[in-house]
């Protein structure tokens, strides 16, 4: 069973009156309709809330919306409707707010059919003031800020035009037509894929892929067979028709798409798809598709160009195109991801890696929990995560996986213990080591959040009743304390807090339902009298990450090196604070071939860690395309694995030479790249 | 094998100071934190501090606050610990101890010195 | 700091007995209690951490319960080699405290 609530677990003194002191009650004088919520800034303390209410009328739907503001983390929210002159906002479009503490955003607004085009209301001031802006074109999507500097946005029309704005949306230019998909990459270069003949759709396949780097003055045409195209990380992505039949490539930029490799992937047909999962400046996870309806693919993981990539994982779930995957970054441990494999029964299992991706096991049973119905051998068992997919499938599953950087080691999930995920309701577990060792955290679904760095986790039952008690913990779920936040249970529809979980507030929001009317509200509670205070040297202990044997020198080495953190000590109840940085000491450790993945043209035999050669290619020359030159690899086999830091050691030797020779990739060869100036 | 291996016993004079060391063999001395904990003869056992080598971070009980110091020399992996105005009650054995599980909260010393006799007296 | 109190401070036993320490701590700790061993001359072992987890190498016969302020260690059937002392250990907060300890001698 979970913690209880035993009258001595971590008791935390007089917080009743502590916390109603700080329980902070607005009721939204709206009619429910739906209600969209969006924080300005960072540490600002600025929400911006948006409710909308539609009623269907015979021949169209009359629709009104209201806009709130709080600059207290939703303590008190001040009626601000009348700045956008009472218009309807266009929910789809939700809350466009600028990067970083820009203090930008962008809400668009619902104009009648005959209109020349959209209307968008601009604010740059923490939403304290708006600009009403007509627009020159019908938005089909969002605003996107550049990332490097937030006066910069881009849009495509409804006539599939990319407009774009360098003065925060004032003033608007169409810089091309006929464009499908548009993404800011860095610098404020922006990739575009264009059809020719008739649509987006028609030409799929058929696309280009272009750049333009001075905001529409000038484009390259960076690629042609375009299927699509993505950015992950410091790579620039690309599928690509093959010239003989329906299959498609990946090819590969790290240079803007100057230049262009074949990814070392199996290239997938037409009812296939390849979708990266994660990527960072180092490598990137590809999943690659099944042929046919399986519901199911192939994990492979690459070198630091993109090119070569090592099998990671089989039978990884991913359900369609745009569908459900599992796959999940932990963000509170480096180098550990969490995803589902289908396995032969059609049972669905979890996996978890902590050498991203180099080797994939289950997840360990928790100490406090038995093996469910799904197990063969009752002392035998695996926890399996609930995630996307069990959230699509309409199961009892509230919430996805829950990790947090500035919370090291934590992560909260709900789950079921057996040999495989079950159907029956789950309960909430916790892992204080990034995965190593689970807990049962709570007893049945609930919603969860993290507050001031991981000091404060609180909880609320998912439930169909009405409810009116939140649960909270001081350390790390172990114990659990219930306050009652208001005597008139609510209907309960999210919890809502800072993102990066810095924050001492905590929001929930629902709705109160009369004979008559029904109601949002929201209840704000503030732990800053919970946590009284400030934490010391005293509060924080020691933790190597990742640390299995603790007798071992190389214990803790992930990927090149050991990290050693501060993390506060469970029974400490103080505050980590608002500006509260993580503190790690890295430390290099000895090379092994651990540290090592499979070159081109050699594979990891299982539980073996020495790579061979791949039978079909012993004896031949190992030849293969980088930057369309042919290119001859000297390897005994080894590529250190991306961001790899180790040193000494092991030392596999690897050579490349360039043959000089032209070879052929699908894609348009650097000479032939076209450009033209408007 | 963890092995935490102390300095000899000392006789010491009132008001004087003393230093022992404490040498850690086997894993990584950097991945825990060492504390102090003394045995005056016939008695219970005292906390007396704490170190962190790695992040040089130390901590003492309030009751020897001013009068110890702890101190740790990584490329050693030596923890040290000096105790001065010394005065007969602080006639003990004084233990070093390290934590094995490095996290969970857990303060619970799995590994111990041999002990270091210190015998204060005029 | 916190207070932590033992009984009984002795108790004499005979091997294949079943012997209960209790331990209190002056305010509640949630179950952040070790239990030592110590014999004569021999710096401590650790047996027992949070309140009942088992020390890898320690025999099952030892137990721990409690929570909060009360806290027993059980030895489910005494052995020769169990005669020694034992103390309890919060580390809920610093500073550290320790019991004054049992003394388990034969009967």
């Known amino acids: 069973s979970a913690p209880g609530e035993d009258e001595e677990c971590g008791r935390v003194r007089d917080f009743v009156a502590k916390l109603a002191n700080n329980t902070h009650q607005h009721v939204f004088d709206d009619l429910r309709g739906s209600v969209s919520l969006s924080w300005v800034g960072d540490s600002t303390g600025v929400i911006l809330v948006l409710t909308t209410f539609h009623v269907p009328l015979v021949i169209m739907t009359f629709g009104q919306s209201k806009l709130y503001r709080s600059e207290d983390y939703g303590k008190n929210f001040k009626d601000i409707t009348d700045l956008i002159n009472n218009t309807f906002i266009r929910t789809e479009f939700g809350m466009a707010i600028g990067p970083e503490n820009s203090g930008k955003v962008v809400l668009t607004a619902e104009v009648s059919g005959g209109s020349r085009g959209g209307r968008i209301f601009r604010s740059s001031d923490f939403a304290k003031n708006f600009v009403q802006t007509d627009l020159p074109f019908h938005p089909l999507t969002q605003m996107m800020y550049s990332p490097q500097n937030s006066d910069y946005l881009l849009a495509l029309s409804t006539e599939n035009g990319l407009w774009v704005s360098k003065n925060f949306g004032g003033k608007w230019e169409e810089i091309h037509k006929a464009v499908c998909l548009a993404k800011w990459g860095s610098d404020n270069t922006i990739f575009f894929t264009t059809y020719a003949n008739g649509s987006c759709k028609a030409d799929l396949g058929a696309l280009e892929l272009w750049r333009t780097s001075d905001l529409g003055k000038s484009f390259k045409t960076i690629g042609v067979k375009i299927y699509s195209f993505g950015l992950g990380g410091r790579f620039l992505f690309a599928s690509v028709m093959a010239d003989k039949d329906t299959t498609r490539r990946i090819h590969v930029s790290t240079d803007q798409g100057d230049t262009w490799s074949m990814a070392q992937l199996p290239s997938v047909g037409q009812e296939q798809f390849y979708s990266i999962l994660a990527a960072n400046d180092d490598m990137v996870f590809m999943h690659v598709d099944e042929p046919g309806d399986t519901g199911f693919g192939t994990i492979f993981t690459s070198d630091d160009r993109g090119i070569v990539y090592s099998k990671s994982l089989d039978r990884h779930l991913y359900t369609t195109t745009g569908g459900e995957t599992d796959f999940t970054n932990v963000t509170s441990l480096r180098g550990v991801y969490i995803t589902s494999v289908l396995s032969e029964d059609n049972s669905i299992q979890t996996m978890i890696t902590f050498d991203q991706g180099g080797r994939w096991t289950h997840l360990r049973k928790p100490e406090n929990s038995e093996c469910d119905a799904t197990a063969k051998n009752k002392n035998e068992c695996s926890l399996h995560i609930h995630a996307s997919y069990s959230i699509s499938q309409k199961l009892n599953v509230p919430m996805a996986p829950l990790s947090e950087p500035n919370a090291v080691g934590i992560v909260i999930a709900h789950g079921s213990v057996g040999d495989a995920i079950s159907v029956m309701v789950p309960d909430v577990y916790i892992s204080d080591d990034g995965g190593y060792s689970w807990t049962k955290m709570l007893e049945g679904p609930h919603y969860y959040t993290i507050l001031d760095s991981g000091g404060i986790i609180v909880a609320i039952e998912h439930s169909s009743r009405p409810i009116n008690v939140i649960k909270f913990s001081t350390d790390e779920g172990q114990c659990w304390q219930t306050y009652t936040f208001t005597r008139d249970p609510i209907y309960f529809t999210g919890l809502a807090s800072e993102p990066g979980a810095r924050s001492m507030n905590i929001s929930i929001w629902g709705f109160t339902e009369s004979f008559l009317t029904s109601q949002w509200v929201s209840y704000t509670i503030d732990f800053k009298d919970i946590l009284e205070r400030n934490c010391e040297e005293k509060d924080y202990t020691i933790w190597l990450a990742h640390s299995t044997d603790p007798e071992d020198y190389e214990d803790g080495c992930i990927l090149g090196y050991k990290e050693q953190f501060l993390r506060l000590r469970k029974s400490s109840v103080c505050q980590n604070g608002r500006d509260y940085v993580v503190t790690k000491q890295p430390s290099i450790c000895l090379c092994s071939l651990e540290d090592f993945l499979c070159d081109f043209g050699y594979y990891r035999p299982e539980n073996d860690s020495k790579c061979v050669e791949q039978p079909e290619l012993k004896g031949h020359d190992l030849e293969f395309c980088l930057y369309g030159r042919e290119e001859h690899l000297t390897t005994n086999g080894y590529r250190k694995i991306p961001g790899d830091k180790c040193q000494g050691g092991v030392n596999p030797v690897r050579e490349v030479k360039d043959l000089k020779k032209k070879c052929t990739s699908n894609f348009l060869s650097p000479e032939k790249q076209n450009s033209k100036s408007n | 094998q963890v092995q935490l291996v102390q300095s000899g016993a000392e006789v010491k004079k009132p008001g004087s100071s003393v230093k022992v060391s404490c040498k850690a063999s086997?894993?990584?001395?950097?991945?825990?934190?060492i504390s102090w904990v003394r045995q005056a003869p016939g008695q219970g056992l005292e906390w007396m501090g704490r170190i962190i080598p790695i992040f040089g971070i130390a901590n003492y009980a309030q009751k020897f606050q001013g009068r110890v110091t702890i101190t740790a020399d990584k490329s050693t992996s030596t923890a040290y610990m000096e105790l001065s105005s010394l005065r007969s009650e602080d006639t003990a054995v004084y233990y070093c101890?390290?934590?094995?599980?490095?996290?969970?909260?857990?303060?619970?010393?799995?590994?111990w010195g041999q002990g270091t006799l210190v015998t204060v007296s005029s | 700091d916190i207070q932590m109190t033992q009984s009984p401070s002795s108790l004499s036993a005979s091997v294949g007995d079943r012997v209960t320490i209790t331990c209190r701590a002056s305010?509640?700790?949630?179950?952040?209690l070790a239990w030592y061993q110590q014999k004569p001359e021999k710096a401590p072992k650790s047996l027992i951490y949070a309140t009942s987890s088992l020390q890898s190498g320690v025999p099952s016969r030892f137990s721990g319960s409690g929570s909060g302020t009360d806290f027993t260690l059980t030895i489910s059937s005494l052995q020769p080699e169990d005669f020694a002392t034992y103390y309890c250990q919060q580390y809920n907060s610093y500073p550290i405290t320790f019991g004054q300890g049992t003394r388990l001698e034969i009967k």
């Open positions: 101890a390290r934590d094995r599980r490095g996290f969970s909260g857990y303060e619970v010393f799995d590994y």
């Open positions: 305010q509640g700790i949630s179950s952040w």
């Open positions: 086997g894993g990584t001395f950097s991945n825990y934190a």
